[in-house]
Interface confidence: low
Amino acid sequence: KFSKQSWGLENEALIVRCPRQGKPSYTVDWYYSQTNKSIPTQERNRVFASGQLLKFLPAAVADSGIYTCIVRSPTFNRTGYANVTIYKKQSDCNVPDYLMYSTVSGSEKNSKIYCPTIDLYNWTAPLEWFKNCQALQGSRYRAHKSFLVIDNVMTEDAGDYTCKFIHNENGANYSVTATRSFTVKDEQGFSLFPVIGAPAQNEIKEVEIGKNANLTCSACFGKGTQFLAAVLWQLNGTKITDFGEPRIQQEEGQNQSFSNGLACLDMVLRIADVKEEDLLLQYDCLALNLHGLRRHTVRLSRKNPIDHHS
């Protein structure tokens, strides 16, 4: 019950707090659990005890193991255990699960990522922050005290964030890094009846015979996560896949999220080598979601080959 997992990287500082709490006036003794050998309190040692804290300056893989702390007061003794694992530094960028601190969630309105365990260390600002091993740059990122603030959070901001700082002990500096995942949750979103932005209803699209033509069906469905929303093209009331004309294909465009937060989708209809008979077809842009379906119809007309101005 009174056991705590702690982990760190070799050649970095690691400070562990005794899982049993007591008043500052209580004494705390630390032992190697395996040997019951007392851990020294002299700061000249690489591993030493300092009240409720056990300090590895710096840590080595061989330090891994279980450490016992006993909080002593005039009336009781309380025992706790610190399960310490020191890992070798990874050569690649990937941070394994076992080195990750708890995942935090943020949203458009609240995007603080706290640097884990930093309160145990003697550090001075500023913190350095990295996302997926890349140093964070740009005005959207602000390192503030012991946390990172991200302005205008987007779903792309989700990922693994590493804070890096220097712990100072009696004039000696030791590096510390800590990584946690950040997920982005939507603010309370809403769903609308689909709004088709393009094409306009009954639009006439001019094309050149023998050339390629693209039609884009673009619609918005609300704000935030839209689980079931789709845009698609139909030819003469038939799905593209069922129409059976290999020259005419549809391709999903990128999901879009505009500055107003609306969630929108694009579907591009690609017509290769436009033929005379393509002008006879009815092209329907369909947008559908949980509220229903909206349809905009487009027809093709032959472009005047000598009027490139239009």
């Epitope: 996560t225 839209q226 079931l228 789709a230 698609l232 999903e252 999901n255 949980l290």
Partner: antibody, heavy 118, light 107 residues
Framework: EVQLLESGGGLVQPGGSLRLSCAAS????????MSWVRQAPGKGLEWVSA????????YYADSVKGRFTISRDNSKNTLYLQMNSLRAEDTAVYYC???????????WGQGTTVTVSS | DIQMTQSPSSLSASVGDRVTITCRAS??????LNWYQQKPGKAPKLLIY???SLRSGVPSRFSGSGSGTDFTLTISSLQPEDFATYYC?????????FGQGTKVEIK
Amino acid sequence: EVQLLESGGGLVQPGGSLRLSCAASDFNFKNAWMSWVRQAPGKGLEWVSAISGNGAGTYYADSVKGRFTISRDNSKNTLYLQMNSLRAEDTAVYYCARVGETGAFDIWGQGTTVTVSS
Amino acid sequence: DIQMTQSPSSLSASVGDRVTITCRASQSISSYLNWYQQKPGKAPKLLIYDASSLRSGVPSRFSGSGSGTDFTLTISSLQPEDFATYYCQQSYSTPPTFGQGTKVEIK
């Protein structure tokens, strides 16, 4: 014949990882929303995750958020579920399913069994 | 999340019987309700979508009705191959949720 075929299940210890795959054939995979649905032994169906056709939209049940990652490779017609930090309660048969335009799961794979036990 | 409650959780019936299973949503889901059949050791199979639309290839003895919060799956004349577990599922909002299932057994 339209079909989905899952693979990658097995026995894993708590805290371990597993990657499930689902190979799709005979439908326009790249435009299809896809989902993972699981069923614990003797229990009902539980939706796990969904992904849009181009992979830009991903959605997760609260019970797996932050631990599972859904992805797809449209060039290989394959759907994936990367499962990390597995727990005993993740033990289940995992099905991949196509999400039809109305939100019904209209095509299902045969399922792959994941057992999380020490 | 929207809760889906099925009743009964199990029932015994004979071949030829008319069987009705109900599904109730914790809030209105319009007609975004789907029904599935699952046999032991097999994947679920979609029977009905949008509350009342019969999936292509599904026998016409299966029918669905309802909208809002109350829905019904009816098997007009139970056949030997219909003994299975039936699930309802809402696709009105994320996350999609299923009912706990109704097991139809041979009397």
